[in-house]
Interface confidence: medium
């Protein structure tokens, strides 16, 4: 028998992170989001739920809503009305799929400072929104849009097609809102709330996926929803605008789909108001490597909206697929005819184009041996957007900005040199006009918002700088992490490594992989996080490390599309090559080596354990995919075509987790699915555990009862880190 | 197969009322835009009507507006053509036809067609 | 609206030879959204081309559609004694506002 090791920080005026600080989130940080209502006004929610106006300009500031008045009503949540008069109260919220919840909504007015009764809103409501203008409201019910001209006034029914499970309108079923919106809404507002635009997803052809939920009753219940699965029967889509002015006059109008779009199966991916009469739709092949830009126009002769051949903008992969995880959208221009957009340029990186006419004639606005990330902004002078060009590490973001109305465009790094150390990774929040903007910074510091001037990009506030976390880290032991790439052939891969405090080189510790790597994602990222991994290190004296592999995002198409149509072979391969070249790093304890992912990580970190190399003696898969025939069609398809005889079947059976159920006979592994996994069904831990069984190998596995993909509720957390903890310190031989 | 069967055509005096059904099969119906084209003795083709997969949009040709309604009926697979105030010039062979996608687009099938005479 | 001008009127060939018909718009036509139709006596139209250039389905590839814009022509290389028949162009570039041209007729010389 090994003898049990115990790892001692040393030094003794700090102490080493606890598991306990970790379930209970004592090291948490806050970042500060303007919640902008014009160029230089914003609310902001206090940290006693008081909901605050901001003018920037004046440097007023006073309590619009109070709260006792959110308290009254037990609310979470609010939206001002376009015209001030009045807020929307969300309370009772009940989480349903990623995105998607529903509430009770109860509308304020400001004027009389009293709840506005009479046609109160029914419950509970699946979506609900003020018009950009005025105070509209539009929300769905029953999977149905209603519509109020004014929040005291009677609904109008929009649709009346809605049935659940059956047909959704204004909002997405679950493929759609997992894999393509990411939202729980598919409804949108012209920007003078004259159209109103919804989508209406039938899904009454398509297979349910249907699982029990234990509750606390006598008989379990049911639970059935309508999921597409690689090469199954998909949602049907239509769009529709309706004129909100006179809903009953003219009822809801189609918009067409594209020719080569809709001449096989197809989907509807994003939708962009460019002006009040023109609408940007974009749809996507099923075969996901075609996408069209449609640009449409209401036609008051015939009340119908027209989207003319000669505004149809295709995008095409010849690669892999279309855009990055999702088709880029577009950043239209003043004139709302030509727009900015992200896609790979001819050397395979995602850069910003501009496009004129035609997708042929556009004119690349960035370029480089790195990416684009997002366009933030496009006013009348600038355009601002993010990338990981700075320095050349793909796991920065930056913000810059490009002045379009200079020729030829100049451009400035608005973050680069701000707080270089502390600050490298980087979102924002532009005012309407990106008059203000407010910069949140992630790290890999701790983590700080900053309000500025969108002229002269000058620091105008700090608005959360997180000065009591930094306070209670005082004391605290944390590990040292270090971003670097290594070099394999003619690949490289970045990683990032979590070293324990008073690391030694000349020591030899144990390593956890924590893997992800699934297509378009990023792990190895210059982020603050005080997390499980960073309590292994911190008291457990593991070495953490994270690699990029191929398949990650930000670092070309080359690298990005090595996966299409061969999924669970790179990726898996990248990781075996990184560990093997930690261990030449000399400092590795080559016998205590395990790996660790949950979701796509699980399925990467079940086949490493598989791979027979004999590198990993335990490791742990959380809610794993074990195979791309089980999850969403939207998905699989997209990085492994179908699963037929004449796609790409026979790779769908050769990536499965089942296929090398022998090769766990080596390896301590264990398995963990949550039973009411809407997303990577429990069906993919049970199809495991069952080749395990078949092919006599032993394993450890956990479920957790009537828990999601997340196993988020406290208690299920709790046990779950607890036992993944006694897990490793077994396999790594470390005392309790 | 795609099909499309015409009925209801007949003769019908000026200022009465008709409707057409046409009954289609063979394809997801509620998935289309359907249109009427009628067809004058003698004469060329001409759009009368359109409606979208759902029903929910209609058009019509100037020549017909406000005497014509186009409906449909999914569950039945049925289109529809009601016409009122019939003229003269409404004499034709009224076809039904398909489009492409769910959208406007060309018409890929066409029904045999009915005959409506208008004529006292 | 958009007005379609098809000529000739009719078109006097024997089988074997090569006919072309042209159909020109008031206005351009929205990228070449046009269609065209086959129609013989007593029977429905049938449709050729679409796309002003792409074949439907089992049309034989001695019909060919081109042109962009207001110009566009349909050509069969080698007329067959089943191809007598009248022809129309349809533009659906302002769909559902659908337009067709008055016809061309070919028949046997």
């Known amino acids: 028998l090994r003898p049990s090791r115990v790892y001692k920080p040393e030094g003794n005026t700090k102490r080493a992170l606890t598991l306990k600080d970790i379930l209970n989130g004592t090291f948490s940080y806050k970042t500060y989001f303007p919640n902008w209502i014009s160029e230089q006004e914003y609310l902001h929610q206090s940290e006693d739920d008081n909901i605050v106006f901001y003018n920037i300009e004046t440097r007023e500031s006073y309590i619009i809503l109070s709260n006792s008045t959110m308290k009254s009503v037990n609310a979470t949540d609010y939206g001002l009305s376009p015209d001030r008069q009045f807020v929307y109260l969300e309370s009772d919220y009940s989480k349903l799929w990623r995105y998607s919840y529903t509430a009770t909504y109860y509308i304020y007015d400001l004027q009389n400072g009293e709840f506005v009764r009479g046609y109160e809103l029914p419950r509970p409501i699946q979506y609900l929104c003020w018009s950009p203008v005025g105070s509209k409201l539009a929300y769905v019910y029953q999977n149905n849009i209603y519509l109020k001209q004014r929040p005291g006034d009677p609904p109008f029914q929009i649709t009346y097609t809605g049935r659940e499970n059956r047909i959704f309108n204004g909002i997405p079923d679950w493929v759609y809102e997992e894999e393509m919106l990411a939202t729980k809404y598919a409804l949108w507002w012209s920007p003078d709330g004259k159209f109103l635009a919804y989508v209406e997803f039938n899904d009454s052809d398509i297979p349910i996926i249907a699982y029990s939920y234990y509750g606390d009753g006598q008989y379990p219940r049911t639970i059935n929803i309508p999921y597409p699965k690689a090469g199954a029967k998909n949602p049907v889509v239509r769009v529709f605008i309706v004129d909100t002015t006179y809903p009953h006059h003219v009822g809801p109008m189609e918009v067409p789909v594209p020719e080569m779009i809709a001449s096989s199966d197809y989907y509807f991916s994003w939708l962009t108001w460019v002006s009040s009469e023109r609408v940007c739709l974009q749809w996507l092949k099923r075969v996901q490597n075609v996408s069209v830009l449609s640009i449409c126009d209401f036609r008051e002769d015939w009340h119908a909206w027209e989207c003319p051949k000669n505004q149809e903008h295709v995008e095409e992969s010849r690669t892999g697929w279309a855009g990055g995880f999702f088709v880029s959208t577009p950043a239209f221009s003043q004139d709302a005819t030509s727009y900015y957009k992200i896609f790979s340029d001819k050397d395979g990186y995602k850069h910003i184009h501009y496009i004129k006419d035609t997708v042929e004639n556009a004119i690349q606005i960035t370029s480089g041996k790195w990416e684009a990330i997002y366009i933030f902004r496009v006013t009348q002078d600038s355009l601002f957007y993010s990338s990981n060009e700075f320095e050349g590490y793909p796991g920065r973001r930056n913000i810059y900005r490009i002045s379009i109305g200079n020729s030829p465009p100049s451009k400035k790094c608005v973050t680069c040199h701000l707080r270089k150390e502390r600050c490298q990774y980087y979102t924002a929040s532009f005012s309407y006009k990106a008059k203000y903007y407010a910069l949140v910074c992630y790290g890999p510091g701790l983590p700080i918002s900053t309000l500025h001037d969108g002229r002269t990009d000058q620091e105008i506030q700090v608005l959360e700088e997180n000065k009591e976390l930094e306070n209670s880290l005082r004391n605290i032991q944390l590990p040292k992490v270090e971003i670097k790439k290594l070099k394999d052939g003619g690949l490289t891969f970045w990683y990032k490594m979590i070293l324990p405090p008073q690391f030694d080189r000349s020591k030899k510790y144990p390593l956890l992989i924590q893997v992800y790597g699934g297509p378009c994602s990023q792990s190895v990222k210059s982020v603050f996080a005080v997390n499980w991994i960073t309590y292994l290190a911190s008291k457990e004296g593991i070495v953490i490390a994270l690699v990029d592999g191929r398949g990650t995002a930000f670092q070309g198409d080359k690298f990005l599309h090595a996966v299409y149509r061969k999924l669970g072979v790179y990726e898996v391969e990248d990781q075996l090559t990184a560990v093997r070249k930690f261990i030449e790093m000399g400092f590795i304890d080559e016998e205590r080596i395990a790996i660790w992912g949950w979701s796509y990580g699980g399925y990467v970190s079940s086949l490493a354990l598989a791979s027979g190399t004999g590198l990993f003696k335990c490791g742990i898969a959380v809610a794993p995919v074990s195979s791309w025939e089980y999850y969403a069609s939207i998905y699989s398809e997209r990085f492994m075509g179908l699963p037929t005889k004449d796609d790409n079947l026979e790779h769908y059976k050769n990536s499965t987790v089942m296929a090398r159920a022998e090769y766990f006979r080596n390896v301590d592994y264990l398995l963990i699915h949550g039973t009411a996994d809407d997303n990577v069904h429990f069906q993919n831990s049970a199809q495991i555990a069952k080749a395990l069984v078949n092919a006599q190998v032993d394993f450890q596995a956990m479920w957790y009862s009537d828990q999601n993909h997340g196993i988020s509720s406290g208690r299920s957390q709790n046990h779950l880190y607890t036992h993944m903890t006694h897990f490793l310190k077994q396999c790594f031989s470390l005392s309790d | 197969e795609v099909q499309l069967l015409e009925s209801g055509g007949g003769l019908v005096q000026p200022g009465g009322s008709l409707r057409l059904s046409c009954a289609a099969s063979g394809f997801t119906f509620s998935s289309y835009a359907m249109s009427w084209v009628r067809q004058a003795p003698g004469k060329g083709l001409e759009w009368v009507s359109a409606i979208s997969g759902s029903g929910g949009s209609t058009y019509y040709a100037d020549s017909v507006k406000g005497r014509f309604t186009i409906s449909r009926d999914n569950s039945k697979n049925t289109l529809y053509l009601q016409m009122n105030s019939l003229r003269a010039e409404d004499t034709a062979v009224y076809y039904c036809?398909?489009?492409?996608?769910?959208?406007?687009?060309?018409?890929?099938?066409w029904g045999r067609g009915t005959l409506v005479t208008v004529s006292s | 609206e958009i007005v379609l001008t098809q000529s000739p009127g009719t078109l006097s060939l024997s089988p074997g030879e090569r006919a072309t018909l042209s159909c020109r718009a008031s206005q351009s036509v929205s990228s070449s959204y046009l269609a065209w139709y086959q129609q013989k006596p007593g029977q429905a139209p049938r449709l050729l081309i679409y796309?002003?250039?792409s074949r439907a389905t089992g049309i034989p590839d001695r019909f060919s559609g081109s042109g962009s814009g207001t110009d566009f022509t349909l050509t069969i290389s080698r007329l067959e004694p089943e191809d007598f028949a009248v022809y129309y162009c349809q533009q659906y570039g302002s769909s559902p506002r659908y337009t067709f041209g008055q016809g061309t007729k070919v028949d046997i010389k």
């Open positions: 036809a398909k489009t492409h996608s769910t959208s406007w687009y060309y018409f890929d099938y």
């Open positions: 796309g002003a250039s």
